[in-house]
């Protein structure tokens, strides 16, 4: 390409007509402020092409970058561009306009800006100020661009003198965004909710503080769109939020929400998503399974556990035997409820050291005013067994017997087991069990009775001995679900005239 | 971590001449605009001259003419010539950003003009 005049540089008087031509071997145009202003084209007959651009009755405003360039999208050499600057001094003219958006100047990053004040004549002195102060910041200046720097968070203005006349420019406004990658949240007031309730939902960036938020969600499919609203939260660091709220949730309005999230700056981009369920009405529903019979073991304590979804939060209550349990003040018994999820609860009943009265037929009842939901339960308090007494005695008829009374809950299981060496029993010879129907040496009666008031079963067994010809440890085991108890007794011949 | 070294000063007559150095290392030096600093005892730090990434330059009025600052970014340093010193010269003097400094101040290096 060659321009003539070539410039770079060119100082032109007002109200003066004058001619640029730009010539190459490709069609050729003059763009200035990224528009072709009106020019002749030609092409000679040695098949270059030119273009002429007369600018006429020159005033500042006529001041700026011209550029020649290639006009075909073939692209000979489609980047080479010829630059000329132009200079039309005007006293008339002061700063030259700026477009709105040049007088923000947006930075992400430490890096060199420029505040492009210009002049329409290279001769004056232009120096720049911040907008609060007179001190000329010693900064460097191009006729051409306007000063250069590293700039703070600040408003800026330059000044010049036309003549006698001192000229300020706009003011500059330089700001420092906060963009960091993209860290977006999403939650809702509710995840569940009732028709006619409202859905609210919040997306949340932290780190930035340019973006753009977008909402889909299931209203929007069928055109009904809803506006959000945008603010920021006032700690650091920059916390934006959009409010996407629904007033009057219809079931239509179940569905997928996604908030999503762009950084123009980086051109970063995040998206979250929540589901919302709109139901027709509330509901409470038992998860997992409670047996119809649950135990606890006396004197120790037992939590008692039901876990259920709800919508909206129910009222609990527990019952014992249709009467409505509190927390007790003796701390015997404890009640609590707690949210584990948006919808789902566990409910617990606590029995610290249980006692025997705290047997019983016990209820969980979850309630609002749209379902409620029951569960019972008998609770079984376990006794571990002890053997009350062991007694040996001769009755008439010469056969010796042994008896053995326990009690426990649940009905403990009886073993009676006798051992004839006395130094090696139990420790080097295992005791023989006694009692099983094939022994004719022993025979055995048991008897068991259930108390109401103390809820456990009692057990008797009578061991009936045919022939004792030597000292015989003779043993009572009582086993039940929670434990075992024992107790021996000496069985001597009647011709013996001791027992031990 | 971006670091500024500044070296060549020293102890010189009014009237003479010394030419310091600042190396900037582990940043985008060609992207920044970089001046000088200095700081007299008991004053103010206060801007001396900058030099853009294209290399246009300013200086304050009290060195204006005397002080010639000017960049390398192959070598990612940046230059101040300083001719004619006076005693009001006397500083500590610093390089950074420009004009308003975003890099951890370095060192500094004592110029001092004295008969």
């Known amino acids: 390409l060659v321009v003539t005049p070539p410039g770079p540089e060119l100082v032109l008087n007002v109200s003066s007509t004058f001619v640029l031509t730009c010539s190459g071997s490709a069609p050729v145009v003059w763009e200035r402020m990224s528009q072709e202003p009106p020019q002749e084209m030609a092409k000679a007959q040695d098949g270059t092409f030119s273009s002429v651009l007369t600018l006429t009755n020159l005033t500042g405003l006529d001041t700026g970058e011209y550029f020649c360039t290639h006009n075909d999208s073939r692209g000979l050499e489609t980047d080479e561009r010829k630059r000329l600057y132009i200079f039309v001094p005007d006293p008339t003219v002061g700063f030259l306009p700026n477009d709105a958006e040049e007088l923000f100047i947006f930075l992400t990053e430490i890096t060199e800006i420029t505040i492009p004040c210009r002049v329409t004549d290279p001769q004056l002195v232009v120096t720049l100020h911040e907008k609060k102060g007179d001190v000329a910041l010693p900064v460097p200046y191009d006729h051409q661009r306007g000063f250069s720097g590293i700039f703070e968070d600040r408003s800026y203005i330059c000044k010049t003198t036309i003549g006698d006349r001192e000229v300020d420019s706009d003011a500059y406004y330089v700001y420092r965004l906060q963009v960091s990658s993209i860290n977006v949240s999403v939650n809702a007031v509710q995840t569940v909710v009732r028709q006619g309730e409202n859905i609210t939902l919040m997306c949340i960036v932290i780190g930035n503080e340019v973006v753009n938020f977008e909402w889909t969600y299931p209203r929007k499919e069928s055109g009904r769109l809803v506006e959000p609203v945008t603010d920021f939260l006032l700690d650091m660091p920059y916390h934006i939020r959009s409010i996407l709220h629904i007033p009057s949730a219809e079931l239509e309005d179940s569905g997928t929400y996604t908030c999503n999230v762009t950084e123009s700056v980086n051109d970063h981009q995040d998206e979250k998503a929540i589901n919302i369920t709109v139901v027709e009405s509330g509901y409470v529903r038992l998860l997992g399974e409670v047996g119809t019979l649950q135990f606890a073991e006396l004197h120790r304590s037992r939590t008692l556990q039901v876990v259920f979804e709800a919508y909206p939060p129910p009222t609990v209550l527990w019952f014992k035997d249709n009467r409505t349990l509190g927390d007790s003040s003796a701390g015997e018994i404890a009640l609590s409820t707690r949210n584990v999820s948006e919808t789902r609860y566990v409910s617990e009943l606590t029995l610290v050291r249980v006692k025997v009265a705290e047997a019983g037929h016990y209820t969980m009842r979850a309630f609002h005013e749209d379902a409620e939901v029951q569960l019972s339960f008998q609770l079984q308090i376990n006794v571990p067994v002890r053997v009350l007494e062991l007694s040996e005695s001769h009755p008439d008829s010469g056969e010796q017997t042994v008896r053995c009374r326990g009690r426990g809950m649940p009905q403990p299981n009886i073993i009676w087991s006798a051992c004839r060496d006395l130094k090696r029993c139990p420790r080097e010879l295992p005791p023989t069990l006694l009692g099983n129907s094939s022994e004719e040496e022993s025979q055995l009666e048991t008897n068991v009775t259930y108390w109401e008031e103390e809820q456990e079963f009692e057990v008797v067994s009578t061991l009936r001995l045919q022939h004792v010809d030597r000292p015989l440890s003779v043993r009572c085991t009582l086993r039940n679900a929670v434990g075992q108890d024992t107790q021996e007794v000496i069985v001597v011949p009647h011709s013996l005239p001791f027992k031990v | 971590e971006v670091q500024l070294v500044e070296s060549g000063g020293g102890l010189v007559q009014p009237g003479g001449s010394l030419r310091l150095s600042c190396v900037v290392s582990?940043?985008?030096?060609?992207?920044?605009?970089m001046g000088w600093f200095r700081r007299a005892p008991g004053k103010q730090r206060e801007l001396v001259a900058g030099?853009?990434?294209?290399?246009?330059?300013a200086a304050a009025d009290s060195v204006k003419g005397r002080f010639t600052i000017s960049r390398d970014n192959a070598k990612n340093t940046v230059y101040l010539q300083m001719n004619s010193l006076k005693p009001e010269d006397t500083a500590v003097y610093y390089c950074?950003?420009?004009?308003?400094?975003?890099?951890?101040w370095g060192q500094g290096t004592q110029v001092t003009v004295s008969s």
């Open positions: 582990g940043s985008s030096f060609s992207s920044y605009t």
């Open positions: 950074n950003t420009y004009p308003h400094a975003y890099l951890e």
């Open positions: 030099v853009s990434t294209v290399g246009d330059t």
